[in-house]
């Protein structure tokens, strides 16, 4: 029942702490304005990592101070999270809301487990 969002099960962050994945949602066909929210689940707690509203014709834009960037194409959103550290390892859930025009739809992905491995410090050279 309702709209579903699909996202990969697992993603490994780069050594620079950057992780990217695609969040795809079932489109109702007439959504002009979409809101995408990235949530991080730790235990039973959900915290918002970043969010953006975009019009279907435009590219996705996150707030300047955001840890996320993204681009959109049709019913697919390519999300990139930056500045990840090992402590940032966790389940990242993509929430998509078709905000306008009515009707409102919401879809939640099952989550992408992002693994972040902090790079080993370079050994001192003599």
């Amino acid at each position: 029942k309702g709209m579903h969002a699909a996202q990969p099960a697992v993603v490994l962050a780069s050594s620079r702490g950057v992780a990217s994945f695609v969040c795809e949602y079932g489109s109702s066909g007439n959504a002009a304005e979409v809101r995408v929210t990235m949530l991080r689940q730790a235990g039973s707690q959900m915290t918002e990592v970043c969010a953006a509203t975009y019009t279907v014709e435009d590219e996705l834009a996150f707030l300047d101070d955001s840890t996320c960037t993204g681009t959109s194409s049709g019913n697919k959103v390519n999300l990139t999270i930056q500045g990840l550290r090992a402590m940032g390892t966790g389940l990242y859930i993509c929430k998509v809301e078709l905000m306008y025009p009515p009707p409102y739809y919401v879809g939640m992905g099952n989550g992408t487990q992002i693994y972040v491995i902090d790079p080993e410090p370079c050994p001192d050279s003599d």
Epitope: G2, E33, R35, Y100, V106
Partner: antibody, heavy 114, light 111 residues
């Protein structure tokens, strides 16, 4: 804390005009499409009008088309509802609502009676 | 006249579980459109307790849950508390009316 505060409700005569305002705070107003929902004792709840985040596109329920105009000023974090040619059946409490139904204002009462 | 049908009232004892039904048609609830549920106390605005069929906004206790089957949506409140005594409304989009439709509300009384 998200707050939506409606003002402008009044006792009006049929055929009159009224403008409701809703001042938003506690969230990025310009990122959200917004709606006006009314609640009348006999008619229950009804979504009256909606507007997209930029203000360029609007939606109206048939009962108010051509009489009501929804607009917004993102610089002032304010949503408006201009109500013209008021009818008895427009009597209701009018709520300002974020379009994903997450938050409602406290409402403002509009009474239309001769 | 509300398009979604709800029982006018339901009652249950403190700590018990209660369900409130919201019956529509193939053009609204049965058409796969998201269902919302609202709680309203006298003289107060509605508060959304379920959006998108089964999602709870933050701050809403997990005692509140919802499901949809066919043309009927159901709100379940378990472990009833005195503060749950209120009016409950459902809503959904109706494709034939191209408008949101609401239930007429159900008054929950805690015994």
């Amino acid at each position: 804390e998200v707050q939506l505060v409606e003002t402008g409700g009044d006792l009006m005569k049929p055929g009159g005009s009224l403008r409701l305002s809703c001042v938003a705070s506690g969230f990025t107003f310009s990122s959200y499409s917004m709606s006006w929902v009314r609640q009348a004792p006999e008619k229950g709840l009804q979504l009256v009008a909606g507007i997209n985040s930029g203000g360029s596109s609007t939606y109206y329920t048939d009962a108010v088309k051509g009489r009501f105009t929804i607009s917004r000023d993102n610089a002032k974090n304010t949503l408006y509802l201009q109500m013209n040619s008021l009818r008895d059946e427009d009597t209701a409490v009018y709520y300002c609502v974020i379009s994903n139904w997450s938050y409602w204002g406290q409402g403002t009462l509009v009474t239309v009676s001769s | 006249q509300p398009v979604l049908t709800q029982p006018p009232s339901v009652s249950a004892a403190l700590g018990q579980r209660v369900t409130i039904s919201c019956t529509g048609t193939a053009t609204n609830v049965g058409g796969g459109y998201d269902v919302q549920w609202y709680q309203q106390f006298p003289g107060r605005p509605p508060k959304t307790i379920i959006y998108g069929n089964y999602n709870r906004p933050s701050g809403v206790p997990d005692r509140f849950s919802a499901s949809t089957s066919g043309t009927t949506a159901t709100l379940t409140i378990s472990g009833l508390q005195a503060e749950d005594e209120a009016n409950y409304y459902c809503s959904s989009w109706d494709n034939s009316l191209t408008a949101y439709v609401f239930g007429s509300g159900t008054q929950l009384t805690i015994l």
